[in-house]
C-alpha cells in the first residue's frame, strides 16, 4: 500500500476518505486506527456501527468521527479541531472476524493556522458543544508519498 498524505490546518476539521471495493468488503465493518511506529500495532481509534446495515450512521470517539457509504464504497473519517498531536500515520481498515485488511495507509499532516497571528476574536474555532454535522470541514490536501520517501524516518 502506498501512503496517502492528508494535510489539514490546526484548529480546523480534516476529512480523510478511503475508497474501497464495495462488493469485496460487503458486510464488513470498518475502522480507523493509528499506527504506533513502523512495526508497531495499529491502535483502534474509532469503528463503524456494530450493525453493518447501519454503517452510514456517524460514530465518534472524542474529536474523531467515522461514517461508511457501504454501497458507494467510501469510508470517511473526520478529525475535528485538528491539533499538532493528531499528526502521524493511520490506517483505514476492513474488519472480518479478528482480522483486519488495510484499505488505505494515511499520513496526517497538521499545518500551522496561517491566521493565528490575528486577534483571536477574528478566529472561529469549533467549540466542544458544536456537533460534527455543524463543524466546517477544510477540504483536505492529499497526495501519495513519492517513491523513495520514508514513511517512518529513522529515529536518532
Amino acid at each position: 500500500h502506498n501512503t496517502t498524505v492528508f494535510q489539514g490546518v490546526e484548529g480546523q476539521s480534516l476529512q480523510v476518505s478511503c475508497p474501497y471495493d464495495s462488493m469485496k468488503h460487503w458486510g464488513r465493518r470498518k475502522a480507523w486506527c493509528r499506527q504506533l511506529g513502523e512495526k508497531g500495532p495499529c491502535q483502534r481509534v474509532v469503528s463503524t456501527h456494530n450493525l453493518w446495515l447501519l454503517s452510514f450512521l456517524r460514530r465518534r470517539n472524542g474529536s474523531t468521527a467515522i461514517t461508511d457509504d457501504t454501497l458507494g464504497g467510501t469510508l470517511t473519517i473526520t478529525l475535528r479541531n485538528l491539533q499538532p498531536h493528531d499528526a502521524g500515520f493511520y490506517q483505514c481498515q476492513s474488519l472480518h472476524g479478528s482480522e483486519a485488511d488495510t484499505l488505505r495507509k494515511v499520513l496526517v499532516e497538521v499545518l500551522a493556522d496561517p491566521l493565528d497571528h490575528r486577534d483571536a476574536g477574528d478566529l472561529w474555532v469549533p467549540g466542544e458543544s458544536e456537533s460534527f454535522e455543524d463543524a466546517h470541514v477544510e477540504h483536505s490536501i492529499s497526495r501519495s508519498l513519492l517513491e523513495g520517501e520514508i514513511p517512518f524516518p529513522p529515529t536518532s
Epitope: W26, N50, L51, L53, L54, L57, R58, R60, D69, L71
Partner: antibody, heavy 126, light 106 residues
Framework: EVQLVESGGGLVQPGRSLRLSCTAS????????MSWFRQAPGKGLEWVGF??????????EYTASVKGRFTISRDGSKSIAYLQMNSLKTEDTAVYYC?????????????????WGQGTMVTVSS | DIQMTQSPSSLSASVGDRVTITCQAS??????LNWYQQKPGKAPKLLIY???NLETGVPSRFSGSGSGTDFTFTISSLQPEDIATYYC????????FGGGTKVEIK
Amino acid sequence: EVQLVESGGGLVQPGRSLRLSCTASGFTFDDYTMSWFRQAPGKGLEWVGFIGSKAYSATTEYTASVKGRFTISRDGSKSIAYLQMNSLKTEDTAVYYCARGKRYSYTYWTPAFDVWGQGTMVTVSS
Amino acid sequence: DIQMTQSPSSLSASVGDRVTITCQASQDITNYLNWYQQKPGKAPKLLIYDASNLETGVPSRFSGSGSGTDFTFTISSLQPEDIATYYCQEYDSYITFGGGTKVEIK
C-alpha cells in the same frame, strides 16, 4: 393502506422449528429494511433482527441470543418477510412482531420502526 | 453493550397534566434514540425518532428532547387515550429498548 400482517405462530415443543411470515401491503416492499421484534408475556420489547432492502442485497443482522438459530429472509415477489426459528427454547416464548424501518432515501434509513404488524404468539412448551 | 434506564417505571397523572419520562443511556448515544407508545394488546407505535422529531400524524402534545446520555419524553397535556406503556429505543450500539414506563390516569 400501509399494512403488515404476521402469521405462523402457535404452540411448539422445545428443540423444534417454526416459520413466521409477515405479509406487507400498501408500499414498495423491496425498498425497506424489515425487522422482527418480540415481547415475552408481561415483559418489554426485544429486537430480534432485520433484513436489508433490495439495495443492500437482503443482508441480515441478528441479536446475539438468536444468532445461528433464527434466519430472516424475504421474498420481494410476494412482499413477505420470514422468520425461520430453529432449536426453539422455552425462553423464546413471546409475541413476535414484524416492523418496517423508516426510510430517508434509496440508501439511507433509520432504525425507527414506523409500521408494525399486529403480532403473532409463539409458545414454546413441552 | 449500552444499557437504557427508563424512569419512572410507572406513573399516575390527571387528565391535562404534563407528563415527563426520562431515558438514560449508559454511554453517549448522540441523538440515536426513538420513543414508542404501546397500548395493551396492541403493537408499538412510533411517536418520536432521532430524539426529537415528531413522527407524521402524531399529536403535537408529544415531544422529545436530549442528546448524549440523557433524554426526555413529554406529554404536554395528558389525554385519556394516552394510557399506555412508553418505551425508548437506542440504535447507537445495537437496537436496545428501555424497560418501559406505564402511564395511568388518576
